[in-house]
Interface confidence: medium
């Protein structure tokens, strides 16, 4: 299905050394607390059946879920990184607010639902895992949306 031209982020969003470093530091600190090594949230299964042109829209869904269901509830943890990274990711989410798919997005929603269920079923350790994969989220957004 074709994508609207709004599914784009400027390259400059991913070329800010300070916030990039803080994002990766946050991910590293959280991953040290993650003991569910069998589950990879952002990986091959997440993108199964999703064309390259649809991946930014998929990552928008993952970003919004991560912000609303993971980062906001865990905002008091992993300081000082969290207080800087969350507003940065929220700005990216805002910039993707007009990103929509023309046509059926059910195949994307299915994959995102699998990620959501995995995080929710793992409980707090699922939230920690999602934070520990913010480096993958960052890189996947970059690869999909610029």
């Amino acid at each position: 299905a074709p994508i609207s031209s709004h599914c784009r982020l400027d390259k400059s969003n991913f070329q800010q050394p300070y916030i990039t470093n803080r994002t990766f530091m946050l991910a590293k600190e959280a991953s040290l607390a993650d003991n569910n090594t069998d589950v990879r949230l952002i990986g091959e299964k997440l993108f199964h059946g999703v064309s390259m042109s649809e991946r930014c829209y998929l990552m928008k869904q993952v970003l919004n879920f991560t912000l609303e269901e993971v980062l906001f509830p865990q905002s008091d943890r992993f300081q000082p990184y969290m207080q800087e990274v969350v507003p940065f990711l929220a700005r990216l989410s805002n910039r993707l607010s007009t990103c929509h798919i023309e046509g059926d997005d059910l195949h994307i929603q299915r994959n995102v639902q699998k990620l959501k269920d995995t995080v929710k079923k793992l409980g707090e350790s699922g939230e920690i895992k999602a934070i520990g994969e913010l480096d993958l989220l960052f890189m996947s957004l970059r690869n999909a949306c610029i």
Epitope: N36, D38, V39, L41, L106, R110, K114, T118, K121
Partner: antibody, heavy 119, light 109 residues
Framework: EVQLVQSGAEVKKPGASVKVSCKTS????????IHWVRQAPGQGLEWMGW????????EYSQKFEGRVTITRDTSATTVYMELNSLTYGDTAVYYC????????????WGQGTLVTVSS | SYELTQDPAVSVALGQTVRITCQGD??????ANWYQQKPGQAPVLVIY???NRPSGIPDRFSASSSGNTASLTITGAQAEDEADYYC????????????FGGGTKLTVL
């Protein structure tokens, strides 16, 4: 509450076909795959196949390929498993189960449907 | 397809600890999921992933993994734990089918 409710017990003759239904509720039907697993009397669990409830794509165990057909009715949020050319060895309890998450967790399961093949 | 191997039967004294194992090549990469099945009932998921319990599953159930072997441990086995236990896992090639181990019949003495 997520529920999978299966159709009632069936008695069939050898060579006949059987169609078992699995009515789902409590979640968005198209977002999850449904698998079928059978269990012969006193035996273990045997995976038969699965269906993508969104687009109807299916995959079957090699053992049942060509003899089993899994379909779905999205408006009825129901999945069906039809097994043809029944033999005595097909006497079993047939279960549907929802695949959850990224790593093949089956939860919940239907209550099971006993299919008896008898002349 | 790939195979998961379980011991057919294991017994444990009431209140003691028992370990049920599942072996297979895919378990070098992925953890097993574990299901409990009581006579005349459908299987129930008791452990998924590294050692995660669905709500309602007692904390006496836990899991571990080493090499190609996954283990389900019941610490302080109760009479109601008497059941068949099955493992399943992803294929290491990430493809279906998704077979189960042959099952282990647990008897609580």
């Amino acid at each position: 509450e997520v529920q999978l409710v299966q159709s009632g017990a069936e008695v069939k003759k050898p060579g006949a076909s059987v169609k078992v239904s699995c009515k789902t509720s409590g979640y968005k039907f198209a977002l999850y795959d449904i698998h079928w697993v059978r269990q012969a009397p006193g035996q273990g669990l045997e995976w038969m196949g699965w269906i993508n409830a969104a687009n109807g794509d299916t995959e079957y165990s090699q053992k049942f390929e060509g003899r089993v057909t899994i379909t779905r009715d999205t408006s009825a949020t129901t999945v069906y498993m039809e097994l043809n050319s029944l033999t005595y060895g097909d006497t079993a309890v047939y279960y549907c189960a929802r695949e959850e998450g990224l790593y093949n967790w089956f939860d919940p399961w239907g209550q099971g449907t006993l299919v008896t093949v008898s002349s | 397809s790939y195979e998961l191997t379980q011991d057919p039967a294991v017994s444990v004294a009431l209140g003691q600890t028992v370990r049920i194992t599942c072996q297979g090549d895919s378990l070098r990469i992925y953890y097993a999921n574990w299901y409990q099945q009581k006579p005349g009932q459908a299987p129930v998921l008791v452990i998924y992933g590294k050692s995660n319990r669905p709500s309602g599953i007692p904390d006496r159930f836990s899991a571990s993994s080493s090499g190609n072997t996954a283990s389900l441990t019941i610490t302080g086995a109760q009479a109601e734990d008497e059941a068949d236990y099955y493992c399943n896992s992803r294929d290491s090639s990430d493809k279906h089918p998704v077979p189960f181990g042959g099952g282990t019949k647990l008897t609580v003495l």
